[in-house]
């Protein structure tokens, strides 16, 4: 559950459960910075633009990232 304004790190909770790629509007990977010392993965869902924070350490999330990047590379010319 992310915040709607940026204060240090963005996420309130992180999930180990992957989201359904078909329900996904976009997936952002925010690298660690001076504002937040950890990588944050924010999934924006198609329905209501709801944002969900995913645990970058979770195996299931790593698999989701691989699947999404594979799908993107298929689409790119």
């Amino acid at each position: 559950v992310p915040l709607s304004r940026t204060v240090r790190c963005t996420c309130i909770s992180i999930s180990n459960q992957p989201v359904n790629p078909r329900s996904l509007e976009k997936l952002e990977i925010i690298p660690a910075s001076q504002f937040c010392p950890r990588v944050e993965i924010i999934a924006t869902m198609k329905k209501k633009g709801e944002k969900r924070c995913l645990n970058p350490e979770s195996k299931a999330i790593k698999n989701l990232l691989k699947a999404v990047s594979k799908e993107r590379s298929k689409r790119s010319p």
Epitope: P2, L3, S4, C9, I12, I14, V19, R38, K48
Partner: antibody, heavy 119, light 111 residues
């Protein structure tokens, strides 16, 4: 199974302090944002504060801002609410409640602890 | 400030259907999800509806939720009322996560 157990409530005089604890078990505490919600006797639910999974973000209701501090110790699976400058209107049952990891609702609540502010 | 307003009380007979409304003011109720919590006397709240119309596992399908953008309101409908449904019901949403807003609560009496 998921358990949230609040403690630390009691009777306290106006202007004094109290610290509530919420011991968590049965889930990955270090992944979960946790809220404090209170309920004055015979009244409705009032959101008090929330802390992010890693403690880096904290938000408070206007009614407690500057007086209450939410914190957590992930090594002990425990949430805290430090309440200073207590007022009669802070009298309530205080619940800790966890956010569902992949959604925006409170899927588990503690049994609550009663705080009575009275002279 | 975003606020949620509920009727103070509603009552209905066993077996009938009851609808509890939750009207938003100071913001659009369909911008974010609405949750409904049930609180039986002397107990902690539990979720009966989340994300507008989703039921947690274990909640019977007699409970349903909906959103009406035109009236800026959410509704909780309970069909086939049972005496065990007698409780206080609270809607909850937010304008800015994670600063939450609860409705004032509705006392449901099953006559």
């Amino acid at each position: 199974q998921v358990q949230l157990v609040e403690s630390g409530g009691g009777v306290v005089q106006p202007g004094r302090s109290l610290r509530l604890s919420c011991a968590a078990s049965g889930f990955t505490f270090s992944n979960s944002g946790i809220h404090w919600v209170r309920q004055a006797p015979g009244k409705g639910l009032e959101w008090v504060a929330v802390i992010s999974y890693d403690g880096s973000n904290k938000f408070y209701a206007d009614s407690v801002k500057g007086r209450f501090t939410i914190s957590r110790d992930n090594s002990k699976n425990t949430l805290y609410l430090q309440m200073n400058s207590l007022r009669a209107e802070d009298t309530a049952v205080y619940y800790c409640a966890k956010l569902r990891d992949n959604g925006e609702y409170l899927d588990y609540w503690g049994q609550g602890t009663l705080v009575t502010v009275s002279s | 400030n975003f606020m949620l307003t509920q009727p103070h009380s509603v009552s209905e007979s066993p077996g009938k259907t009851v609808t509890i409304s939750c009207t938003g003011s100071g913001g659009s109720i369909d911008r974010n999800y609405v949750q409904w919590y049930q609180q039986r006397p002397g107990s902690s709240p539990t979720t009966v509806i989340y994300e507008d119309n989703q039921r947690p596992s274990g909640v019977p399908d007699r409970f349903s939720g909906s959103i009406d953008s035109s009236s800026n309101s959410a509704s909780l409908t309970i069909s086939g009322l049972k005496t065990e449904d007698e409780a206080d019901y609270y809607c909850q949403s937010y304008v800015e996560t994670p600063e939450w807003v609860f409705g004032g609560g509705t006392k449901l009496t099953v006559l």
